[in-house]
Amino acid sequence: SEVEYRAEVGQNAYLPCFYTPAAPGNLVPVCWGKGACPVFECGNVVLRTDERDVNYWTSRYWLNGDFRKGDVSLTIENVTLADSGIYCCRIQIPGIMNDEKFNLKLVIKPAKVTPAPTRQRDFTAAFPRMLTTRGHGPAETQTLGSLPDINLTQISTLANELRDSRLANDLRDSGATIRIG
Protein backbone atom coordinates (compact mmCIF):
# COMPACT_ATOMS: atom_id res chain seq x y z
CA SER A 1 0.00 0.00 0.00
CA GLU A 2 1.03 3.58 -0.52
CA VAL A 3 2.98 5.61 2.00
CA GLU A 4 0.92 8.61 3.13
CA TYR A 5 2.06 12.23 3.26
CA ARG A 6 0.10 15.26 4.40
CA ALA A 7 0.02 18.95 3.66
CA GLU A 8 -2.39 21.81 4.22
CA VAL A 9 -4.09 23.87 1.55
CA GLY A 10 -1.80 26.72 0.54
CA GLN A 11 1.36 25.01 1.70
CA ASN A 12 4.00 23.31 -0.41
CA ALA A 13 3.76 19.53 -0.33
CA TYR A 14 6.87 17.36 -0.37
CA LEU A 15 6.96 13.81 -1.70
CA PRO A 16 10.34 12.15 -1.04
CA CYS A 17 12.11 9.92 -3.54
CA PHE A 18 15.83 9.19 -3.76
CA TYR A 19 18.39 7.06 -5.50
CA THR A 20 22.17 7.06 -5.38
CA PRO A 21 23.96 7.53 -8.72
CA ALA A 22 27.10 5.44 -9.07
CA ALA A 23 29.04 8.61 -9.80
CA PRO A 24 28.21 12.31 -9.97
CA GLY A 25 26.47 13.04 -13.24
CA ASN A 26 25.86 9.34 -13.93
CA LEU A 27 22.10 9.84 -13.69
CA VAL A 28 19.14 7.57 -14.25
CA PRO A 29 15.94 8.91 -15.84
CA VAL A 30 13.11 9.53 -13.39
CA CYS A 31 9.47 10.36 -13.94
CA TRP A 32 6.78 11.62 -11.59
CA GLY A 33 3.15 11.02 -12.45
CA LYS A 34 -0.26 11.63 -10.94
CA GLY A 35 -1.87 8.28 -10.24
CA ALA A 36 -0.45 4.94 -9.18
CA CYS A 37 2.58 3.64 -11.06
CA PRO A 38 1.58 1.60 -14.09
CA VAL A 39 3.78 -1.23 -15.37
CA PHE A 40 5.54 1.00 -17.89
CA GLU A 41 6.53 4.64 -17.58
CA CYS A 42 4.44 7.10 -15.54
CA GLY A 43 0.83 8.01 -16.20
CA ASN A 44 -0.15 11.70 -16.30
CA VAL A 45 3.46 12.85 -16.14
CA VAL A 46 4.05 16.04 -14.15
CA LEU A 47 7.86 16.03 -14.20
CA ARG A 48 10.60 14.05 -15.89
CA THR A 49 14.38 13.94 -15.78
CA ASP A 50 16.77 12.33 -18.23
CA GLU A 51 20.44 11.37 -17.89
CA ARG A 52 21.41 15.04 -17.68
CA ASP A 53 18.62 17.39 -16.68
CA VAL A 54 14.99 18.01 -15.87
CA ASN A 55 13.54 17.81 -19.38
CA TYR A 56 9.83 18.17 -18.66
CA TRP A 57 7.85 19.81 -15.90
CA THR A 58 4.48 21.41 -15.37
CA SER A 59 3.60 24.47 -13.31
CA ARG A 60 3.78 24.09 -9.51
CA TYR A 61 5.79 20.85 -9.74
CA TRP A 62 9.53 21.03 -9.21
CA LEU A 63 12.57 19.34 -7.71
CA ASN A 64 13.87 21.30 -4.77
CA GLY A 65 16.75 18.96 -3.93
CA ASP A 66 19.92 18.18 -5.85
CA PHE A 67 18.65 15.72 -8.43
CA ARG A 68 22.22 15.29 -9.71
CA LYS A 69 22.92 13.53 -6.41
CA GLY A 70 19.78 11.42 -6.71
CA ASP A 71 17.37 13.56 -4.70
CA VAL A 72 14.36 13.51 -6.99
CA SER A 73 11.84 14.42 -4.30
CA LEU A 74 8.86 16.28 -5.72
CA THR A 75 7.66 19.61 -4.39
CA ILE A 76 4.13 20.71 -5.26
CA GLU A 77 3.67 24.42 -4.77
CA ASN A 78 0.64 26.03 -3.11
CA VAL A 79 -1.48 22.87 -2.94
CA THR A 80 -5.24 22.68 -3.15
CA LEU A 81 -7.62 19.89 -2.21
CA ALA A 82 -7.53 18.78 -5.86
CA ASP A 83 -3.86 17.81 -5.43
CA SER A 84 -4.86 14.94 -3.14
CA GLY A 85 -4.22 11.49 -4.50
CA ILE A 86 -1.56 8.97 -5.44
CA TYR A 87 1.72 10.06 -7.03
CA CYS A 88 4.22 7.76 -8.71
CA CYS A 89 7.98 8.20 -8.51
CA ARG A 90 9.67 5.90 -11.02
CA ILE A 91 13.44 5.36 -11.13
CA GLN A 92 13.95 4.18 -14.71
CA ILE A 93 16.81 1.72 -14.43
CA PRO A 94 17.81 0.44 -17.87
CA GLY A 95 16.20 -2.84 -18.84
CA ILE A 96 12.68 -4.08 -19.35
CA MET A 97 11.72 -4.98 -15.78
CA ASN A 98 14.28 -3.14 -13.69
CA ASP A 99 12.48 0.10 -12.77
CA GLU A 100 11.88 0.92 -9.11
CA LYS A 101 8.33 2.16 -8.56
CA PHE A 102 7.11 4.07 -5.51
CA ASN A 103 3.51 5.08 -4.90
CA LEU A 104 3.06 7.96 -2.48
CA LYS A 105 -0.31 9.12 -1.22
CA LEU A 106 -0.77 12.83 -0.71
CA VAL A 107 -3.55 13.91 1.65
CA ILE A 108 -4.44 17.60 1.58
CA LYS A 109 -6.13 19.02 4.66
CA PRO A 110 -8.02 22.31 4.80
CA ALA A 111 -5.92 25.14 6.17
CA LYS A 112 -6.24 25.66 9.93
CA VAL A 113 -8.14 28.73 11.00
CA THR A 114 -5.89 29.32 14.00
CA PRO A 115 -2.21 29.96 13.31
CA ALA A 116 -0.19 26.76 13.38
CA PRO A 117 3.12 26.51 15.24
CA THR A 118 6.08 27.48 13.09
CA ARG A 119 7.57 24.51 11.27
CA GLN A 120 10.96 24.22 9.71
CA ARG A 121 9.49 22.43 6.71
CA ASP A 122 6.11 22.30 5.01
CA PHE A 123 6.02 18.56 4.71
CA THR A 124 5.77 15.29 6.52
CA ALA A 125 8.84 13.10 6.10
CA ALA A 126 9.04 9.37 6.60
CA PHE A 127 10.78 6.67 8.55
CA PRO A 128 13.17 4.69 6.37
CA ARG A 129 12.10 1.20 5.38
CA MET A 130 14.30 -1.42 3.79
CA LEU A 131 13.22 -1.93 0.21
CA THR A 132 13.22 -5.29 -1.47
CA THR A 133 13.72 -6.01 -5.13
CA ARG A 134 12.56 -9.10 -6.94
CA GLY A 135 15.48 -11.42 -7.54
CA HIS A 136 15.47 -12.35 -11.20
CA GLY A 137 18.68 -14.34 -11.27
CA PRO A 138 21.88 -13.83 -13.23
CA ALA A 139 20.26 -12.38 -16.33
CA GLU A 140 19.41 -9.13 -14.59
CA THR A 141 22.94 -8.71 -13.33
CA GLN A 142 24.30 -9.32 -16.80
CA THR A 143 21.88 -6.86 -18.35
CA LEU A 144 22.87 -4.11 -15.96
CA GLY A 145 26.52 -5.03 -15.98
CA SER A 146 26.75 -4.87 -19.74
CA LEU A 147 25.72 -1.24 -19.90
CA PRO A 148 28.80 0.89 -20.54
CA ASP A 149 27.60 4.15 -19.01
CA ILE A 150 25.31 3.05 -16.22
CA ASN A 151 26.86 1.49 -13.16
CA LEU A 152 24.04 1.99 -10.74
CA THR A 153 24.82 0.60 -7.34
CA GLN A 154 22.23 1.95 -4.98
CA ILE A 155 18.70 3.20 -4.86
CA SER A 156 17.12 4.76 -1.84
CA THR A 157 13.82 6.17 -0.79
CA LEU A 158 12.10 7.37 2.31
CA ALA A 159 9.17 5.16 3.05
CA ASN A 160 6.82 4.72 6.03
CA GLU A 161 4.85 7.63 7.33
CA LEU A 162 6.24 9.92 10.01
CA ARG A 163 3.45 11.92 11.55
CA ASP A 164 5.68 14.02 13.80
CA SER A 165 7.19 16.54 11.43
CA ARG A 166 9.65 17.74 14.07
CA LEU A 167 11.81 14.75 13.16
CA ALA A 168 11.80 15.63 9.48
CA ASN A 169 15.24 17.21 9.45
CA ASP A 170 16.83 14.34 11.33
CA LEU A 171 15.48 11.85 8.85
CA ARG A 172 15.99 13.88 5.72
CA ASP A 173 19.04 11.94 4.55
CA SER A 174 18.46 8.60 6.22
CA GLY A 175 16.78 6.69 3.40
CA ALA A 176 17.46 2.99 3.22
CA THR A 177 19.53 1.74 0.32
CA ILE A 178 19.57 -1.31 -1.85
CA ARG A 179 22.32 -2.57 -4.09
CA ILE A 180 21.74 -3.63 -7.68
CA GLY A 181 23.87 -6.22 -9.36
Epitope: C37, P38, F40, I96, R134, L147
Partner: antibody
Framework: QVQLQQPGAELVRPGTSVKLSCKAS????????MHWVNQRPGQGLEWIGV????????DYNQKFKGKATLTVDTSSSTAYMQLSSLTSEDSAVYYC????????????WGQGTTLTVSS | DFVMTQTPLSLPVSLGDQASISCRSS???????????LHWYLQKPGQSPKLLIY???NRFSGVPDRFSGGGSGTDFTLKISRVEAEDLGVYFC?????????FGGGTKLEIK
Amino acid sequence: QVQLQQPGAELVRPGTSVKLSCKASGYTFTSYWMHWVNQRPGQGLEWIGVIDPSDSSTDYNQKFKGKATLTVDTSSSTAYMQLSSLTSEDSAVYYCARNDYDGGYFDYWGQGTTLTVSS
Amino acid sequence: DFVMTQTPLSLPVSLGDQASISCRSSQSLLHSNGNTYLHWYLQKPGQSPKLLIYKVSNRFSGVPDRFSGGGSGTDFTLKISRVEAEDLGVYFCSQTTHVPWTFGGGTKLEIK
Protein backbone atom coordinates in the same frame (compact mmCIF):
# COMPACT_ATOMS: atom_id res chain seq x y z
CA GLN B 1 8.18 -26.88 -15.00
CA VAL B 2 6.48 -23.61 -15.87
CA GLN B 3 2.83 -23.98 -16.82
CA LEU B 4 0.07 -21.50 -17.60
CA GLN B 5 -3.33 -23.20 -17.52
CA GLN B 6 -6.35 -21.69 -19.26
CA PRO B 7 -9.87 -23.04 -19.80
CA GLY B 8 -10.35 -24.28 -23.35
CA ALA B 9 -13.49 -22.35 -24.26
CA GLU B 10 -16.12 -19.88 -23.09
CA LEU B 11 -19.48 -19.18 -24.72
CA VAL B 12 -21.17 -15.94 -23.70
CA ARG B 13 -24.02 -13.69 -24.80
CA PRO B 14 -23.53 -10.27 -26.39
CA GLY B 15 -23.66 -7.39 -23.90
CA THR B 16 -22.44 -9.49 -21.01
CA SER B 17 -19.00 -9.77 -19.38
CA VAL B 18 -16.62 -12.66 -18.97
CA LYS B 19 -13.65 -13.26 -16.68
CA LEU B 20 -10.92 -15.42 -18.21
CA SER B 21 -8.42 -17.14 -15.94
CA CYS B 22 -4.78 -18.16 -16.22
CA LYS B 23 -3.34 -20.31 -13.43
CA ALA B 24 0.44 -20.23 -13.16
CA SER B 25 2.63 -22.93 -11.67
CA GLY B 26 6.27 -23.94 -11.62
CA TYR B 27 7.71 -20.51 -10.83
CA THR B 28 7.37 -17.58 -8.43
CA PHE B 29 4.21 -15.90 -9.67
CA THR B 30 5.03 -12.41 -8.37
CA SER B 31 8.43 -12.29 -10.07
CA TYR B 32 7.26 -12.13 -13.68
CA TRP B 33 4.80 -9.94 -15.51
CA MET B 34 1.75 -11.57 -17.05
CA HIS B 35 0.48 -10.44 -20.42
CA TRP B 36 -2.68 -11.11 -22.39
CA VAL B 37 -2.69 -11.47 -26.15
CA ASN B 38 -5.62 -12.17 -28.46
CA GLN B 39 -5.94 -13.72 -31.88
CA ARG B 40 -9.09 -13.36 -33.94
CA PRO B 41 -9.96 -16.22 -36.28
CA GLY B 42 -7.41 -16.40 -39.07
CA GLN B 43 -5.72 -13.21 -37.86
CA GLY B 44 -2.49 -12.17 -36.22
CA LEU B 45 -1.58 -11.60 -32.58
CA GLU B 46 -2.53 -8.47 -30.67
CA TRP B 47 -1.15 -7.38 -27.31
CA ILE B 48 -3.94 -6.46 -24.88
CA GLY B 49 -2.08 -5.51 -21.73
CA VAL B 50 0.14 -6.53 -18.85
CA ILE B 51 -0.07 -6.85 -15.09
CA ASP B 52 2.76 -6.96 -12.58
CA PRO B 53 1.60 -9.46 -9.95
CA SER B 54 3.98 -8.04 -7.35
CA ASP B 55 1.97 -4.84 -7.01
CA SER B 56 -1.04 -5.31 -9.36
CA SER B 57 0.08 -2.40 -11.54
CA THR B 58 -1.21 -2.62 -15.08
CA ASP B 59 -0.77 -1.19 -18.54
CA TYR B 60 -3.04 -1.58 -21.53
CA ASN B 61 -2.98 -1.26 -25.26
CA GLN B 62 -5.05 1.89 -25.80
CA LYS B 63 -7.36 -0.13 -28.03
CA PHE B 64 -8.41 -2.33 -25.09
CA LYS B 65 -8.76 0.32 -22.39
CA GLY B 66 -12.30 0.11 -21.07
CA LYS B 67 -12.75 -3.31 -22.63
CA ALA B 68 -10.23 -5.37 -20.64
CA THR B 69 -9.45 -5.28 -16.92
CA LEU B 70 -6.48 -7.26 -15.61
CA THR B 71 -6.26 -8.55 -12.04
CA VAL B 72 -4.35 -11.20 -10.12
CA ASP B 73 -4.93 -13.40 -7.09
CA THR B 74 -1.46 -14.05 -5.73
CA SER B 75 -2.74 -16.58 -3.18
CA SER B 76 -3.73 -18.90 -6.01
CA SER B 77 -1.12 -17.70 -8.53
CA THR B 78 -3.89 -16.86 -10.97
CA ALA B 79 -4.19 -13.99 -13.42
CA TYR B 80 -7.56 -12.83 -14.68
CA MET B 81 -8.81 -10.75 -17.56
CA GLN B 82 -12.34 -9.41 -17.48
CA LEU B 83 -13.85 -8.40 -20.81
CA SER B 84 -16.94 -6.22 -20.69
CA SER B 85 -19.78 -5.22 -23.05
CA LEU B 86 -19.02 -8.16 -25.28
CA THR B 87 -19.83 -8.18 -28.98
CA SER B 88 -19.16 -10.69 -31.74
CA GLU B 89 -16.01 -8.69 -32.51
CA ASP B 90 -14.57 -9.92 -29.21
CA SER B 91 -14.75 -13.54 -30.35
CA ALA B 92 -11.14 -14.69 -30.42
CA VAL B 93 -8.58 -16.90 -28.76
CA TYR B 94 -7.16 -15.19 -25.67
CA TYR B 95 -3.70 -16.20 -24.47
CA CYS B 96 -1.93 -15.38 -21.25
CA ALA B 97 1.84 -15.24 -21.57
CA ARG B 98 4.67 -14.71 -19.12
CA ASN B 99 7.46 -12.39 -20.11
CA ASP B 100 11.07 -13.08 -19.30
CA TYR B 101 12.65 -10.41 -17.12
CA ASP B 102 15.73 -10.15 -19.29
CA GLY B 103 14.29 -9.19 -22.63
CA GLY B 104 10.57 -8.65 -22.63
CA TYR B 105 9.87 -11.72 -24.71
CA PHE B 106 7.12 -14.23 -23.97
CA ASP B 107 8.91 -17.38 -22.89
CA TYR B 108 5.82 -19.32 -21.79
CA TRP B 109 2.27 -19.15 -23.13
CA GLY B 110 -1.03 -20.60 -21.99
CA GLN B 111 -2.88 -22.83 -24.42
CA GLY B 112 -5.47 -20.12 -24.96
CA THR B 113 -9.17 -19.76 -24.24
CA THR B 114 -11.48 -19.64 -27.24
CA LEU B 115 -14.12 -16.99 -26.49
CA THR B 116 -17.28 -17.15 -28.55
CA VAL B 117 -19.74 -14.28 -28.25
CA SER B 118 -23.06 -15.34 -29.72
CA SER B 119 -26.75 -15.05 -29.01
CA ASP C 1 1.55 2.41 -32.65
CA PHE C 2 4.74 0.79 -33.86
CA VAL C 3 3.83 -1.13 -36.98
CA MET C 4 5.62 -4.39 -37.76
CA THR C 5 5.47 -5.45 -41.40
CA GLN C 6 6.34 -9.03 -42.31
CA THR C 7 7.12 -10.31 -45.78
CA PRO C 8 6.26 -12.52 -47.47
CA LEU C 9 2.73 -13.29 -46.31
CA SER C 10 3.15 -16.87 -47.51
CA LEU C 11 6.39 -18.75 -48.14
CA PRO C 12 6.15 -22.05 -50.06
CA VAL C 13 9.31 -24.14 -49.61
CA SER C 14 10.58 -27.64 -50.26
CA LEU C 15 11.89 -29.65 -47.32
CA GLY C 16 15.64 -29.11 -47.01
CA ASP C 17 15.46 -25.64 -48.58
CA GLN C 18 16.60 -22.45 -46.88
CA ALA C 19 13.82 -20.04 -45.89
CA SER C 20 14.10 -16.35 -45.10
CA ILE C 21 11.44 -14.13 -43.51
CA SER C 22 11.70 -10.36 -43.26
CA CYS C 23 10.32 -8.09 -40.54
CA ARG C 24 10.41 -4.31 -40.79
CA SER C 25 9.40 -1.88 -38.06
CA SER C 26 8.03 1.61 -38.55
CA GLN C 27 10.65 3.02 -36.14
CA SER C 28 13.98 1.87 -34.79
CA LEU C 29 13.78 -0.88 -32.19
CA LEU C 30 17.05 0.10 -30.55
CA HIS C 31 16.21 0.80 -26.92
CA SER C 32 17.90 3.62 -25.03
CA ASN C 33 19.64 0.94 -22.94
CA GLY C 34 21.44 -0.41 -26.01
CA ASN C 35 19.34 -3.54 -26.48
CA THR C 36 17.08 -4.30 -29.42
CA TYR C 37 13.92 -6.07 -28.34
CA LEU C 38 12.90 -7.94 -31.49
CA HIS C 39 11.73 -11.53 -31.13
CA TRP C 40 10.43 -14.37 -33.33
CA TYR C 41 7.69 -16.93 -32.58
CA LEU C 42 6.34 -19.97 -34.41
CA GLN C 43 2.69 -20.91 -34.15
CA LYS C 44 1.66 -24.33 -35.37
CA PRO C 45 -2.00 -25.04 -36.19
CA GLY C 46 -4.15 -25.33 -33.08
CA GLN C 47 -1.28 -24.39 -30.76
CA SER C 48 -0.13 -21.32 -28.89
CA PRO C 49 2.92 -19.47 -30.23
CA LYS C 50 6.35 -20.72 -29.16
CA LEU C 51 9.43 -18.54 -28.75
CA LEU C 52 12.23 -19.19 -31.24
CA ILE C 53 14.55 -16.19 -31.15
CA TYR C 54 14.79 -13.36 -28.64
CA LYS C 55 16.57 -10.02 -28.84
CA VAL C 56 17.30 -10.32 -32.57
CA SER C 57 19.65 -13.29 -32.61
CA ASN C 58 19.47 -15.38 -29.42
CA ARG C 59 18.02 -18.86 -29.79
CA PHE C 60 15.63 -19.85 -27.01
CA SER C 61 16.42 -23.07 -25.16
CA GLY C 62 15.65 -26.17 -27.19
CA VAL C 63 15.46 -24.32 -30.50
CA PRO C 64 17.54 -26.06 -33.22
CA ASP C 65 20.56 -24.21 -34.59
CA ARG C 66 19.09 -24.21 -38.09
CA PHE C 67 17.14 -21.15 -36.89
CA SER C 68 19.02 -17.86 -36.86
CA GLY C 69 18.05 -14.22 -36.51
CA GLY C 70 19.73 -11.02 -37.54
CA GLY C 71 19.27 -7.37 -38.35
CA SER C 72 19.30 -4.02 -36.59
CA GLY C 73 17.41 -0.75 -36.37
CA THR C 74 14.26 -1.33 -38.40
CA ASP C 75 15.13 -4.34 -40.58
CA PHE C 76 15.29 -7.90 -39.28
CA THR C 77 15.45 -11.38 -40.77
CA LEU C 78 14.72 -14.91 -39.60
CA LYS C 79 16.51 -17.65 -41.50
CA ILE C 80 15.90 -21.40 -41.46
CA SER C 81 18.89 -23.12 -43.04
CA ARG C 82 17.23 -26.46 -43.87
CA VAL C 83 13.47 -26.56 -43.54
CA GLU C 84 12.03 -29.64 -41.83
CA ALA C 85 8.39 -30.74 -41.68
CA GLU C 86 8.10 -29.68 -38.03
CA ASP C 87 9.01 -26.09 -39.01
CA LEU C 88 5.77 -25.53 -40.90
CA GLY C 89 3.40 -23.00 -39.41
CA VAL C 90 3.02 -19.24 -39.02
CA TYR C 91 6.01 -17.15 -37.95
CA PHE C 92 5.50 -13.88 -36.10
CA CYS C 93 8.00 -11.17 -35.27
CA SER C 94 7.36 -9.05 -32.19
CA GLN C 95 8.83 -5.88 -30.74
CA THR C 96 8.92 -5.00 -27.05
CA THR C 97 11.06 -1.89 -27.24
CA HIS C 98 8.06 0.42 -27.45
CA VAL C 99 4.65 0.36 -25.77
CA PRO C 100 2.26 -0.97 -26.92
CA TRP C 101 4.13 -4.17 -27.68
CA THR C 102 3.27 -5.24 -31.22
CA PHE C 103 3.45 -8.24 -33.53
CA GLY C 104 3.97 -8.61 -37.24
CA GLY C 105 1.09 -9.92 -39.32
CA GLY C 106 2.65 -13.35 -39.70
CA THR C 107 4.31 -15.40 -42.45
CA LYS C 108 2.93 -18.83 -43.29
CA LEU C 109 5.64 -21.35 -44.10
CA GLU C 110 4.15 -24.15 -46.19
CA ILE C 111 5.20 -26.98 -48.44
CA LYS C 112 5.62 -26.06 -52.10
